[in-house]
Interface confidence: low
């Protein structure tokens, strides 16, 4: 049957342009005394005519399209109309949310992959720093760096890993290698069992100064924000999916049937529902869904606040891509204090000092290749930061999505212009009056009662999840104009600041060492996947006609109306056909 309906849709699509050129229709002919028109319409909807009366009947068994006189509908037809009306409604809802859904799904996938790539680049930069500046550390350093960045990836994706532990593990692992390879390269093999002691001494003696704490602060803050950003996008998908697949109630089905199909029972094939009446019905049907609106608005605004705060130490791209430089600075700090450290560790870890091991602290410029990592510095390169802001701007065009849904669906289904000569659910009227319509409908359904039922359990659940994520987003959002919070001010430095002790200065990166300033060259591997305008059905040029159709600015982004139109085409054409 579905195949037949689909085929019929395509055939009738051509007829539609003749039936509905968009101008006001002439007054409809009197009801068909033989139900012929109703039979031919219903034949397209449901092959076989056994349910359609040959001539008008009393219709005493009808429950929805209550007749004022003889009717061309039977109870079975009414049931079919109800089913079709609910399916049409579900299709319209899915079409309405398609662009928004794709926007979030695409971005969630893209940002997840992009963050993985940032992590990979950060790892490569850090490895390159070791290879160029400390070749004797490379085999082990590569391993520790790899483990650290694997943990970073897992943390972003929600693993229960403590960031401080990750950073501590990195420095705990690095120090024994630095000590035995750089500071005491002549250390005999018998002394190499001191690694555990060195790991402990690393913390007790603060051998890397304030750098581990600085990295902990920056990494934990930037990764927390990144993680919540991804969680929020994934919840956005869940919200749309939930409302996308709502099953409308029987009450709603009856209201929709009255609006879209009951006119046929009277042989009024060309008449359209009154616009005001459509709005009343849609608000009734979507009362539960519209309750999401308040939390959806808050979600987008909270996400915007989060994104606005994602800079400097709250931007993982900036933090991770600059990590190689901070690690390099931390090793230089160890080397500056090599003499003092060697003596202290010699006493603490009690390895035999039978001969004086030469200290391997060399002048900084001997270690630094002036060309190293110049490739990392890319001017005017598009960053994830700009992509995030772009996403927020697009999302903000959907801020009224839920409150605007009833109006949107009415504007995308056939309704009479100016509420003149239209169907009000009971009869053809010259002009629609909401009060008269409500009075006339009292016996048929209680619209107020339908609204008062409250949202479905799935909607309530998604509202709870939105409340939770909104709270998290608010907690994470940074106060404007402040980058560092109280904790960092009290316990550490921001990169570029210096303490009283010159040794604690976390400033420059050494001659020729070039810091990466929030620049990630996406090149071939990422650029295309970040282009969220490449939505299904998107065409690069929209015709004026397309723009006229997609005029509902409050509901969604209309930069590229063909995106929505193409995806809606089949369902809406079928819907037009099935309704009128």
């Amino acid at each position: 049957m579905a195949g037949t309906v689909r085929t019929a849709c395509l055939v009738v699509a051509m007829l539609l342009s003749l039936d509905f050129p968009g101008q006001a229709q002439p007054p409809p002919p009197p009801p068909d005394a033989t139900c012929h028109q109703v039979r031919s319409f219903f034949q397209r909807l449901q092959p076989g005519l056994k349910w359609v009366p040959e001539t008008p009947v009393p219709g005493s068994d009808l429950q929805v399209c209550l007749p004022k006189g003889p009717t061309c509908c039977s109870r079975k037809m009414e049931e079919k109309y109800q089913l079709t009306a609910r399916l049409n409604m579900e299709q319209l809802l899915q079409s309405a949310s398609m662009e928004l859904k794709f926007l979030i799904i695409q971005n969630a996938a893209v940002f997840q992959e992009a963050f993985e790539i940032v992590v990979r680049h950060a790892k490569n930069y850090t490895n390159a720093m070791f290879k160029n500046n400390y070749p004797s550390l490379t085999p082990q350093a590569f391993e520790f760096v790899g483990e650290f960045f694997t943990d970073v990836s897992l943390y972003i994706l929600g693993s229960d890993i403590n960031v401080d532990d990750m950073v501590n593990e990195l420095f705990d692992s690095l120090f024994p290698v630095i000590y035995t390879q750089l500071m005491n390269p002549g250390l005999p093999d018998s002394a190499l069992d001191i690694n555990e002691c060195l790991r402990g001494a690393r913390r007790d003696l603060k051998v890397f100064g304030n750098f581990p704490k600085l990295i902990m602060t920056q990494v934990s803050k930037s990764l927390q924000v990144t993680r919540i950003f991804l969680q929020a996008l994934n919840l956005g998908i869940e919200v749309i999916n939930t409302t996308d697949h709502l099953k409308f109630s029987k009450d709603c089905g009856r209201m929709l049937t009255r609006m879209w199909y009951c006119s046929y029972c009277q042989g009024l094939m060309m008449v359209k529902p009154c616009g005001g009446y459509c709005n009343v019905v849609m608000q009734g049907c979507m009362a539960g869904v519209v309750e999401i609106d308040k939390y959806w608005r808050e979600y987008i605004l909270s996400l915007e606040e989060l994104v606005n705060g994602m800079y400097r130490i709250y931007d993982m791209e900036n933090v991770l891509l600059g990590l190689f430089s901070t690690i390099h600075d931390s090793i230089q700090y160890v080397q500056k204090n090599a003499g003092k450290l060697t003596t202290t560790i010699g006493k603490l870890c009690a390895h035999s000092q039978q001969r004086q091991y030469r200290s391997a602290y060399y002048p900084e410029d001997l270690f630094i290749d002036k060309k190293v990592l110049k490739v990392a510095h890319v001017e005017h390169e598009e960053t994830l930061s700009s992509r995030r802001r772009e996403l927020i701007q697009k999302l903000k065009s959907f801020i009224s999505f839920y409150s605007a849904l009833p109006g949107y669906i009415c504007s995308h289904s056939p309704v009479a212009e100016n509420d003149t000569l239209c169907w009000n659910g009971q009869e053809l009227v010259e002009r629609y009056s909401q009060k008269a319509a409500r009075n006339g409908m009292k016996n048929q359904f209680n619209l107020h009662e339908l609204k008062m039922k409250g949202p479905e359990p799935v909607v309530s659940q998604i509202i709870d999840k939105l409340k939770h994520i909104n709270q998290l987003l608010r907690t994470m959002s940074m106060p404007k104009g402040r980058v560092l919070d109280k904790n960092l001010d009290e316990e550490g430095f921001e990169s570029g600041d210096c303490g009283d002790d010159e040794d604690e200065c976390i400033g420059g990166s050494g001659d020729g060492m070039i810091k990466v300033k929030n620049q990630l060259r996406f090149l071939a591997e990422l650029a295309y996947d970040l282009d969220v305008d490449d939505a299904p059905g998107n065409s690069q040029q929209a015709t004026p006609k397309d723009n006229e159709i997609s005029t509902f600015h409050n509901l969604g982004n209309v930069h590229s109306p063909l995106k929505l139109l193409t995806s809606m085409a089949i369902s809406v054409v079928c819907f037009f056909f099935l309704v009128h």
Epitope: Q106, E116, S153, L154, L526, A527, Y528, D534, A535, S539
Partner: antibody, heavy 116, light 105 residues
């Protein structure tokens, strides 16, 4: 030089599970990139099935998601495919490959026939 | 799911001839990758990110395109180019085209 080699049974009975192994040499599967399974049906149609990223994150083709699993053994530098409830439609040449956005290195492939 | 349609399904070319294989996407994609598969071997990366030649690929191969239409051009066909050619995209997950078989006359 990185090399990938697939291994597994050539013949599987319908409704049983298919298990394949990809052994990687010359490159650590935890260093970077993604490690994929792709199959090619007798008519030469190619289908991406799944990947496991260097960090352990997995992704599956939605059409197979309910019956597919990809895992790895980092110590042996191997990754694995398990496809449950196979039918004759799953008869194909199965390839493992490396790559995120595209696949730059492929194994030679292993042919699997599903038949009773 | 994005569907990639390659045309023609089979192409016959003479040595030295310039030919173009096309790949059409059901929805807009931003990049396309191309593979060559010779009989009895696994696919080999030919071009990635629409137009970048993979390592060791002769310069007679080139790629171009945008949106929903992409092409692979061989400027002067050689006997060793007889093979199946596939396009690949990834937006939400990866899909391959149905392939074009290139035969040499």
């Amino acid at each position: 030089d990185v090399q990938l080699q697939e291994s597994g049974p050539g013949l599987v009975k319908p409704s049983q599970s298919l298990s394949l192994t990809c052994t990687v040499t010359g490159y650590s599967i935890t260093s970077d990139s993604a490690w994929n399974w792709i199959r090619q049906f007798p008519g030469n149609k190619l289908e991406w099935m799944a990947y496991i990223m260097y960090s352990g994150i997995t992704s599956y083709n939605p059409s197979l998601k309910s019956r597919i699993s990809i895992t790895r053994d980092t110590a042996k530098n191997q990754f694995f495919l398990q496809l449950n409830s196979v039918t004759t439609e799953d008869s194909a040449t199965y390839y493992c490959s490396r790559g995120y956005w595209y696949f730059d290195v492929w194994g030679a492939g292993t042919t699997v026939t599903v038949s009773s | 799911q994005i569907v990639l349609t390659q045309s023609p399904a089979i192409m016959s070319a003479s040595l030295g001839e310039e030919i173009t294989l096309t790949c059409s996407a059901s929805s807009s994609v931003s990049y396309m990758h191309w593979y060559q598969q010779k009989s009895g071997t696994s696919p080999k990366l030919l071009i990635y990110s629409t137009s970048i030649l993979a390592s060791g690929v002769p310069s007679r191969f080139s790629g171009s395109g945008s949106g929903t239409f992409y092409s692979l051009t061989i400027s002067s066909v050689e006997a060793e180019d007889a093979a199946d050619y596939y396009c690949l995209q990834w937006i939400t997950y990866r899909t391959f085209g149905g392939g074009t078989k290139l035969e040499i006359k």
